[in-house]
């Protein structure tokens, strides 16, 4: 494959988290500033995925501000939209319930729980804070709703309200008809590339999502955000973003898409159906 | 009944190399992510590392980072730790210990002796 | 790393009284996910060590009740309501909710 054949690859793996974002500025780091007031003000954690409080120095800083947690809601967070993620009669797990626990390449060491395959079970682990994969949840709870099977056998889904995508109605979850197509791309790919805080010169790739492509920067070593890849293959196969179509027996079919050839027109970070 | 079992300690010079076995029985073995423990002569206990399920992934002890190296076969219910530059403050004994649901060590080998000295 | 600090270091006990060995953290052991990652380990005389309790108070399989684990935040107790000769060797409080695992320096149980 060409570069340019490469760069427009639809992507359908699953295993790092949907893009949950409504705008790219709710992936920006928290910044202060460089002002010494003390002023109270939120800010939304794509780690944790909640809006939280931080202190902001009173001049510059990003977009990733808002003057109340319920402005910050409202702008990143999306209570009040439904995610468009698979719902089938008889669910599957989702493929990322099969993987590996993944620490990842970071040591701020966290507790987060995965499906254990062999067990059945979700088990607890600890998490480097960065990179990783998606059999990696917050909760517990979370973890048995999305990858344990229910008392009948069947998946227990908490993946919310799914669309009908012959007529863009939503349809209930007791739905037999599957939604067409699945959106599935990470939000810290929207993150800019971040050094870090240490003095090594380390070669990385970050994704670029003003111009859609990977792009190569120097990692200090420490620190930085998880829009880093150790590979230009690792980092498109993360951040391109990709559709799954889903035909009506639960199967996958991986599209491959070229530039001159687009068949689907769908906007990258507004993927979500509005509550009726 | 869950078993595992030590072997490969013994004396080497610093600076050299060891590799340890533990060999498990009794139990799913690539259900569970795997430690190595070790214990100085008359001290207390030392975590030395962590291996995950699969073997794809471990964790280190800053003590022994880039220094050993931990590795499982799943196949052969095998569980290793190679020690390379070992130092004289590595002679212990080294136990491996299986990891639960909670990521809490349960059940530990009889341990086996590696010491290190010219 | 957080630092396990258990006293005393050693405990001489007559036959069928009780025992109580303590372990402090230098930092809370409560999880985010609200539990207690604080642990006893039992090692006899030249034998290798075996769980005794987990998640503060639980019991392993096939220890006895006499033994009982309380405590939370950053102090932790074991009990031992009537100490048996089995019961002679070191005792090992250890934290799994921070990482790296720590294990405190082992309190020496022995009769009097």
């Known amino acids: 494959d060409s570069e340019e054949d490469e760069e427009h690859t639809i992507i359908t793996d699953t295993e790092l988290p949907p893009l949950k974002l409504m705008h790219s500025f709710c992936a920006f780091k928290a910044d202060d500033g460089p002002c010494k007031a003390i002023m109270k003000r939120f800010f939304f954690n794509i780690f944790t995925r909640q809006c939280e409080e931080f202190i902001y120095g009173g001049c510059e800083g990003n977009q990733n501000r808002f003057e109340s947690l319920e402005e910050c809601k409202k702008m990143c967070t999306r209570d009040n939209a439904n995610r468009i993620i698979k719902t089938t009669l008889q669910q599957e797990k989702p493929d990322f319930c099969f993987l590996e626990e993944d620490p990842g390449i970071c040591r701020g060491y966290i507790t987060r729980y995965f499906y254990n395959n062999q067990t059945k079970q979700c088990e607890r682990f600890k998490y480097g804070g960065c990179l990783g994969n998606m059999n990696n949840f917050e909760t517990l709870e979370e973890c048995k709703n999305i990858c344990e099977d229910g008392p009948n056998g069947f998946q227990v889904d908490n993946y919310g309200t799914q669309l009908n995508a012959v007529n863009n109605s939503l349809t209930p979850q007791s739905t037999k008809v599957p939604s067409l197509f699945e959106f599935h791309g990470p939000s810290w790919c929207l993150t800019p590339a971040d050094r870090g805080l240490c003095r090594a010169n380390e070669n990385r790739f970050y994704y670029n999502s003003v111009i859609g492509k990977c792009r190569p920067f120097k990692y200090s070593g420490c620190g930085g955000n998880e829009n880093n890849f150790t590979s230009k293959q690792e980092c498109l196969r993360a951040c391109k973003k990709g559709f799954i179509q889903r035909i009506s027996k639960g199967g996958l079919i991986k599209t491959k898409r070229k530039r001159k050839k687009q068949r689907v027109k769908i906007a990258y970070e507004e993927i979500f159906v509005k509550n009726m | 009944e869950v078993q595992l079992v030590e072997s490969g300690g013994g004396l080497v010079k610093p600076g050299g190399s060891l590799r340890l076995s533990c060999a498990a029985s009794?139990?799913?073995?690539?259900?569970?992510?795997m430690n190595w423990v070790r214990q100085a002569p008359g001290k207390g206990l030392e975590w030395v590392g962590t291996i995950t399920t699969g073997g794809s992934y471990t964790y280190y002890a800053d003590s022994v980072q880039g220094r050993f190296t931990i590795s499982r076969d799943n196949a052969k219910n095998s569980l290793y730790l190679q020690m390379n530059s070992l130092r004289a403050e590595d002679t212990a004994v080294y136990y491996c210990?299986?990891?639960?649901?909670?990521?809490?060590?349960?059940?530990w080998g009889q341990g086996t002796l590696v010491t290190v000295s010219s | 790393d957080v630092v396990m600090t258990q006293t005393p270091l050693s405990l001489p006990v007559t036959l069928g009284q009780p025992a109580s060995i303590s372990c402090k953290s230098s930092?809370?052991?409560?999880?985010?996910?609200?539990?207690?990652?604080l642990n006893w380990l039992q090692q006899r005389p030249g034998q290798s060590p075996k769980r005794l309790i987990y998640l503060v108070s639980k019991l392993d399989s096939g220890v006895p009740d006499r033994f009982t684990g309380s405590g939370s935040g950053t102090d932790f107790t074991l009990k031992i309501s009537r100490v048996e000769a089995e019961d002679v060797g070191v005792y090992y409080c250890?934290?799994?909710?921070?990482?790296?695992?720590?294990f405190g320096q082992g309190t020496k149980v022995e009769i009097k």
């Open positions: 250890w934290q799994g909710t921070h990482f790296p695992f720590t």
């Open positions: 930092q809370s052991l409560l999880d985010v996910d609200g539990k207690t990652y």
């Open positions: 210990a299986r990891q639960d649901g909670n990521f809490l060590m349960d059940y």
């Open positions: 009794g139990f799913t073995f690539s259900s569970y992510a």
